[in-house]
């Protein structure tokens, strides 16, 4: 199974200090992965290469994303990417890419969380994306 | 074979101007790769996807890591990641990720070297890690 | 098929506001991919993991690369990497890595474009490279 996703939108819930991205498939092979709004549901357990990139346009001193999984009654951070940002708005433009190999369980929900309220993201599909490759 | 490693600790030997990370397996499939202190020994020769991320909290003007291999009487750099760092300690927080596909030989020892003495690293397993996927 | 490429040189054509890299193979397995000067020709259609890193030594406020494909009468950006750069030449040293999974067609030409005239790149094979893995 292979899935490459691109953004639909990004939102911060009221009173939330995080921003989440809603995803749609751009490339899909196999039935083992299912985009579900702000998350991706794992249908086939196994070892996956996960990758995530977010394009930030924000002068907050550091920006980044956390890729986490929720399932079997617990939430767990898998990996994160962190980027220091310039304080000048014209210069504050950085993509942050990270990836890793993880064992995912059936029913796990994977999501990308930016731990900032109303983070300024560029939701171009070339700059912000999320992907899975079953190994 | 698949191996995803996370840090145990990082040290600079006396009189050394480099910092090395000691690794432990977080995910392992197959017997082709063996964590050995500061290095990973290749048991099965072949083509591997290697990935490395280090999370830096250091105001040194540029930081980064080198992934190198030692074996068969030679030592060489495979790839490196470089990140310019802000001079203010509160802002100096950057992950540096890189990856590539390389042919590794039986007996090769792979290691991650930060070419700075006593580099200030964040050894969280979500921010600093090393991985191998046999293709 | 697997292909890992390293730079031969990088050039900006007269009156062009982009810099392109010319590539040579460092590792090749299979016949599905062919280095062709500034591009890589896809011989075997399929789903590929593509990765790109460029090492920048440039004080231009933001630098980065675009990985694009040309084929079937159209040009398309697949993904890009963006890095804000310090204004001081001694600090302006950043690698920019990105990757993703894409469906490539037979005859597609893949290239790495830096959308700056005469971009200052470090063409070390350890810092600037391009790769493909057929999944």
């Amino acid at each position: 199974s292979v899935l490459h996703l691109v953004p639909i939108n990004a939102t911060s819930k009221d009173d939330s200090d995080v921003t989440e991205v809603m995803w749609q498939p751009a490339l899909r092979r196999g039935r083992g992965l299912q985009a579900q709004g702000y998350g991706v549901r794992i249908q086939d357990a196994g070892v996956y290469l996960l990758y995530s990139q977010v394009l930030f346009q924000d002068v907050t001193f550091t920006m980044g994303q956390v890729v986490s999984r929720e399932g079997q009654g617990r939430q767990e951070t898998l990996f994160r990417c962190i980027r220091s940002m310039p304080s000048h708005p014209d210069r504050a433009y950085n993509s942050c890419y990270s990836a890793g190999v993880f064992h995912l369980h059936q029913g796990d929900i994977l999501s990308v969380i930016i731990p900032r309220a109303r983070a300024k993201l560029n939701l171009s599909p070339h700059g912000t994306f999320l992907g899975f490759v079953k190994l | 074979s698949v191996l995803h490693l996370v840090p145990i600790n990082a040290t600079s030997k006396d009189d050394s101007d480099v910092t090395e990370v000691m690794w432990q397996p977080a995910l392992r499939r197959g017997r082709g790769l063996q964590a050995q202190g500061y290095g990973v020994r290749i048991q099965d020769a072949g083509v591997y996807l290697l990935y490395s991320q280090v999370l830096f909290q250091d105001v040194t003007f540029t930081m980064g890591q080198v992934v190198s291999r030692e074996g068969q009487g030679r030592q060489e750099t495979l790839f490196r990641c470089i990140r310019s760092m802000p001079s203010h300690p509160d802002r100096a927080y950057n992950s540096c990720y890189s990856a590539g596909v390389f042919h590794l030989h039986q007996g090769d020892i792979l290691s991650v070297i930060i070419p700075r003495a006593r580099a200030k690293l964040n050894l969280s397993p979500h921010g600093t890690f090393l991985g191998f996927v046999k293709l | 098929s697997v292909l890992h490429l390293v730079p031969i040189n990088a050039t900006s054509k007269d009156d062009s506001d982009v810099t392109e890299v010319m590539w040579q193979p460092a590792l090749r397995r299979g016949r599905g991919l062919q280095a062709q000067g500034y591009g890589v020709r896809i011989q075997d259609a399929g789903v590929y993991l593509l990765y790109s890193q460029v090492l920048f030594q440039d004080v231009t406020f933001t630098m980065g690369q675009v990985v694009s494909r040309e084929g079937q009468g159209r040009q398309e950006t697949l993904f890009r990497c963006i890095r804000s750069m310090p204004s001081h030449p001694d600090r302006a040293y950043n690698s920019c890595y990105s990757a993703g999974v894409f469906h490539l067609h037979q005859g597609d030409i893949l290239s790495v474009i830096i959308p700056r005239a005469r971009a200052k790149l470090n063409l070390s094979p350890h810092g600037t490279f391009l790769g493909f893995v057929k999944l």
Partner: antibody
């Protein structure tokens, strides 16, 4: 562009030592091993050993073990080869060479050579 | 150690002719599909220059008239049409096993 520039010719007495330098420029010095190769007059090429400047790791050919010392100064991007207990058969041109790592596995750049003459 | 043997020791060729140089290793210099065999050119008073690496890949700036072939223990350097600047000594070298070793060289001279 990549350059390796070596120190000048030396004349030495038997039993003494010689230290030859090799200054690298045009690339990241710590990323590549520097090797030393010598060539006696009218003879072929003989490999002596290498240093990986990033870590200071070294490897010497068995023939020269105990007599050769290869070092590197990262601050000046310079490698050094010192050969001790010199004898007349050590008269040769000594070359430093950069090893092109995984993508060539060969000596892709060479210094111009340093002639060392051992004579009483 | 791996012993590299080059033949002939001297090759006399006229300009424009083809030259074929041989290099034999005492044991295989192939490792996991990679051929750790390289060719260098050396002119009098100069350092060697890399021509061919990994048995068959031309180094940057090397003309297409130079080509390399072979595997395991038998390798060949071919110069398709000798130019005046090609008259020199050619060395093969293996980097599969420590210590790295060179062949004794083939001198290509004008006939």
């Amino acid at each position: 562009q990549v350059q390796l520039v070596q120190s000048g010719a030396e004349v030495k007495k038997p039993g003494s030592s010689v230290k030859v330098s090799c200054k690298a420029s045009g690339y990241t010095f710590t990323d590549y091993t520097i090797h030393w190769v010598r060539q006696a007059p009218g003879q072929g090429l003989e490999w002596m050993g290498w240093i990986y400047p990033l870590r200071g790791s070294i490897n010497y050919a068995q023939k020269f073990q105990g007599r050769v010392t290869i070092t590197a100064d990262k601050s000046t991007s310079t490698a050094y080869m010192e050969l001790s207990s010199l004898r007349s058969e050590d008269t040769a041109v000594y070359f430093c060479a950069r090893h092109g790592a995984y993508y060539s596995n060969a000596f892709d750049y060479w210094g111009q050579g340093t002639l060392v003459t051992v004579s009483s | 150690e791996i012993v590299m043997t080059q033949s002939p020791a001297t090759l006399s060729v006229s300009p424009g002719e083809r030259a074929t140089l041989s290099c034999r290793a005492s044991e295989s210099v192939d490792n996991d599909g990679i051929r750790f065999l390289h060719w260098y050119q050396q002119k009098p008073g100069q350092a060697p220059r890399l021509l061919i690496y990994r048995a068959s890949t031309r180094a940057t700036g090397i003309p297409a008239r130079f080509s390399g072939s072979g595997s395991r223990t038998e390798f060949t350097l071919t110069i398709s049409s000798l130019q005046s600047e090609d008259f020199a000594v050619y060395y093969c070298q293996q980097s599969n096993k420590d210590p790295y070793t060179f062949g004794g060289g083939t001198k290509v001279e004008i006939k």
